[in-house]
Amino acid sequence: QTPGPCSWNFSGPEGSLDSPTDLSSPTDVGLDCFFYISVYPGYGVEIKVQNISLREGETVTVEGLGGPDPLPLANQSFLLRGQVIRSPTHQAALRFQSLPPPAGPGTFHFHYQAYLLSCHFPRRPAYGDVTVTSLHPGGSARFHCATGYQLKGARHLTCLNATQPFWDSKEPVCIAACGGVIRNATTGRIVSPGFPGNYSNNLTCHWLLEAPEGQRLHLHFEKVSLAEDDDRLIIRNGDNVEAPPVYDSYEVEYLPIEGLLSSGKHFFVELSTDSSGAAAGMALRYEAFQQ
């Protein structure tokens, strides 16, 4: 290896990086050497320091490449024997700058190998949970929500192979929807938007609960907290806005602690809020039972 600018390219899954030793040509400049490492996309570069003995003033720097900007990973003050440096990208570069003779360059011996990159652990949704099979490409994440909350987004995500592996969409969120139709309602919960935080103003939410054929519904008031103005909760014994009310927060001061029973298989729940004031709203539990 002639002194002066020098560089080597490594593209296998592993290899050795050794300081240049053949310095037979006399020169009055030091070395400025580059070792470029490239492994498969989806893998990172792990460099282990087997040996290092530098002279004062000499530098070794390691950077991760392949991202938008080089990523500084280590320099000679950090590179002690046994140290492991990991680049989170599939390319890395090591630069060695030595002193001119008569001092001569120091020596080092590094070993690199590719390692499988992974997706970050997915964020658990508020009012829900996530289960993960693997964080490596091909792994999957499944999300679900607490009773009464609905998933907004894709329930199942897959970790995809890429320069930086990633989940194939942003994690879904669990929301308390403003109304909805719940068919085959056996057991569950409906909550007002924002619950347990405050609902927002100017809402009109309608929920239709429908028990399985031949069954009726029992509705239990877990919590009802309405602002003392024109906010209103009505529960109707039927499947539409015209059905007779069995509970109306305008008419009744106290909640029926025994809950409500439907005469048929439906309950129709209405929540309306005005332009001022807010509160926690409501959480209602339902269960179906044989007639």
Epitope: A154, R155, T158, D168, S169, K170
Partner: antibody, heavy 115, light 111 residues
């Protein structure tokens, strides 16, 4: 290799319904989303919705709630899209695609709604 | 919904030259260091084909003359050198948020 084979062209009358199929092969059908995408003649692409065959989970675009119904049969590795109450604006080519990043596409099914 | 605006609507590029297509999102499509922006190519009578995913990753089997870049709201698809077979309509698409949306398309003609 991954393949999505769609059913043939359809000519139907306004007000009728149609069911388009998408037969998947070459990958684990149950654990990848199947999307449906609409393309009107000379127009861009519009997402309709998706189904996760393993559990039957569905997500729909607001524009197609009540218009499209997505189902899947794991035993035959086939996904279906039913379109109801058809009008002339439903005339289009419909594609099925695999995954949230739509890496494979069916060849398309042309639907013509005409009396 | 996230709106994707492509420009130009059409362009003509000489064989061997560079084609550059832009896509701007109405809000950022970045999350956890990943840009959820993808590029597709569609030829007449054919389905779209995935070229680039997550802004810059070239899909398996796609020639290296296709490359993607960008982050946040601004993304670019480059084709260099352009070949005869590249004549098609190109679409950007975001998958960070439901509903997934597509750009209006850019038609590439080879001179």
């Amino acid at each position: 290799q991954v393949q999505l084979q769609q059913s043939g062209p359809e000519l139907v009358k306004p007000g009728a319904s149609v069911k388009i199929s998408c037969k998947a092969s070459g990958y684990a059908f149950s654990s990848s989303w199947i999307n449906w995408v609409k393309q009107r003649p000379g127009q861009g692409l519009e997402w309709i919705g998706r189904i996760y065959p393993g559990e039957g989970d569905t997500n729909y675009s607001g524009n197609f709630e009540g218009k499209a119904t997505l189902t899947a049969d794991k035993s035959s590795t086939t996904a279906y899209m039913q379109l109801s109450s058809l009008t002339s604006v439903d005339s289009a080519v419909y594609f099925c695609t695999r995954g949230l990043v739509m890496d494979y596409w069916g060849q398309g099914t042309a639907l013509t709604v005409s009396s | 919904d996230i709106v994707l605006t492509q420009s130009p609507a059409s362009l003509a590029v000489s064989l061997g030259q560079r084609a550059t297509i832009f896509c701007r999102a109405s809000q950022s499509v970045d999350y956890n260091g990943i840009s959820y922006m993808h590029w597709f190519q569609q030829k007449p009578g054919q389905p779209p084909k995935l070229l680039i995913y997550a802004a810059s990753n070239v899909q398996s089997g796609i020639p290296a003359r296709f490359s993607g870049s960008g982050s946040g709201t601004d993304f670019t698809l480059n084709i260099h050198p352009v070949e005869e077979e590249d004549a098609a309509t190109f679409y950007c698409q975001q998958s960070i948020e439901d509903p997934p949306t597509f750009g209006g398309g850019t038609k590439l003609e080879i001179k």
